[in-house]
């Protein structure tokens, strides 16, 4: 992989420890928490980033209505188990032996159970809806300009192939970005929509994961876009399995 040779850092992941101990003295970077080697030429998987975060010291124009099966990450942070490729393991458990099943973005998709809980496969999140509310601006945003700028951002900053940005909707002050990526569409080397969405989410919160970059400056024809709130909905290829008790709560 390519880490910055001169000062041996990982441009795409600040939560790494890098040293010139790779083959031929090349710079090699390992994720905090897991110690796994990461490819610094692309985004690091969300699972490894969450693990690193938990190990770090604590310091048409119409909007889309999320499907009834859409998941929102209400559980927040946890220390995940990642497989050897850095993906989330289908079953996650905490220190008190409470277990649950997650999707490919690490969001819980079943009720919590005990160690006997089975999660047969890692269900893929194939559709992500990012719902943003922007701050009032002095100048209005043109929909097509906004669309182009957000597509450019995902292509250039997050290295996500343009075909995976399905749509950008805008009804002031709400912006919705739809990312779609089926298992069959994702080729080797393609950035996962879940990873791109996570990097974007952290950028929007002012917690950039990129090494040495300032905060994300997103402008539409020079007019800065500032985000007041973010909601992210995750849709899985197989609908989640929650009890009726949770659904009516």
């Amino acid at each position: 992989h390519t880490a910055a040779q001169d000062n041996c850092t990982c441009p795409t992941n600040k939560m790494t420890v890098c040293s010139p101990d790779g083959p031929g003295g090349r710079c090699q970077c390992r994720a905090l928490g897991s110690g796994m080697a990461v490819d610094c030429s692309t985004l690091t998987s969300k699972c490894l980033l969450l693990k690193a975060r938990m190990s770090a010291p604590k310091n048409a124009r119409t909007l889309v209505r999320p499907s009834e099966h859409a998941l929102v990450d209400n559980d927040g942070l946890y220390d995940p188990d990642c497989d050897p490729e850095g993906r989330f393991k289908a079953r996650q458990c905490n220190q008190t032996s409470v277990c649950w099943c997650v999707n490919s973005v690490g969001v819980r998709r079943t009720d919590k159970g005990d160690l006997s809980l089975r999660c047969d496969e890692l269900v893929r999140t194939h559709h992500i809806l990012i719902d943003l509310r922007h701050r009032p601006t002095a100048g209005a945003f043109n929909h097509s300009d906004l669309d182009a700028e957000l597509r450019r951002l995902f292509r250039e900053r997050y290295r996500l192939h343009p075909k995976f940005v399905a749509a950008v909707h805008y009804e002031q002050p709400t912006i919705q970005i739809e990312l779609r990526q089926n298992t069959s569409q994702k080729a080797a080397g393609d950035v996962d929509i879940g990873d791109a969405a996570y990097y974007f989410e952290r950028d929007i919160k002012g917690e950039s994961l990129f090494q040495g970059r300032g905060g994300l400056d997103l402008r539409v024809r020079g007019e800065p876009l500032q985000v007041e709130r973010t909601l992210i909905y995750y849709l899985d290829e197989i609908p989640p399995k929650f009890s009726m008790k949770r659904l009516t709560a």
């Epitope: 701050r135 009032p136 002095a138 100048g139 950028d203 929007i204 919160k205 002012g206 300032g214 905060g215 994300l216 400056d217 997103l218 402008r219 024809r221 020079g222 007019e223 800065p224 876009l225 500032q226 985000v227």
Partner: antibody, heavy 122, light 106 residues
Framework: QVQLVQSGAEVKKPGASVKVSCKAS????????INWVRQRPGQGLEWMGW????????KYNEKFKGRVTMTVDTSTSTVYMELSSLRSEDTAVYYC???????????????WGQGTLVTVSS | EIVLTQSPATLSLSPGERATLSCSAS?????IYWYQRKPGQAPRLLIY???NLASGIPARFSGSGSGTDYTLTISSLEPEDFAVYYC?????????FGQGTKVEIK
Amino acid sequence: QVQLVQSGAEVKKPGASVKVSCKASGYTFTSSDINWVRQRPGQGLEWMGWIYPRDGSKKYNEKFKGRVTMTVDTSTSTVYMELSSLRSEDTAVYYCATRFATVVSNYGLDPWGQGTLVTVSS
Amino acid sequence: EIVLTQSPATLSLSPGERATLSCSASSSVNYIYWYQRKPGQAPRLLIYDTSNLASGIPARFSGSGSGTDYTLTISSLEPEDFAVYYCQQWNSYPLTFGQGTKVEIK
């Protein structure tokens, strides 16, 4: 550190034009807009407009539209403000100031250039 | 255009005293920015997004407010704080500044 250095004082006759330059250093020039603000003697601050060097986008105060032109030279990290059809009431100190912003905050006008005194007199 | 009215026009205080400067907008704005200007110098940003201290600005400066009424407070005046203070809005074009409040030594 971030710095804006403006061109020197100018004396112009009514009806003439003036072009003030503002050279930026210490940051990625294309990453923030450059605003122009003037202060007439004994008066407050008056915003004239901004230009965004990355794509050349501009926003002018309607009061100066047709008389003000902002341009950018990315090769030298310099922004220019030209004011035409000068009259005596355009006598003022003209400042350039950069505005940094992220998706989290608008950081205001900071820093400012040292100012350029433009005197319009017959 | 949004008119910002600052009061008082002049504030006469002694070093060590508390200064409270007001900025009233003709229509609701989301955020206000405060600048300090000394004779012969360029303005300097003090507060951005209503209440955030700009880089290098001492903690004795603070900002607050919402809607149409905003305040800049200097908790204990230092000799170098005697200057003219301006508020500014970024809510709609044209961007506008208040006419300024002069803080002078009593």
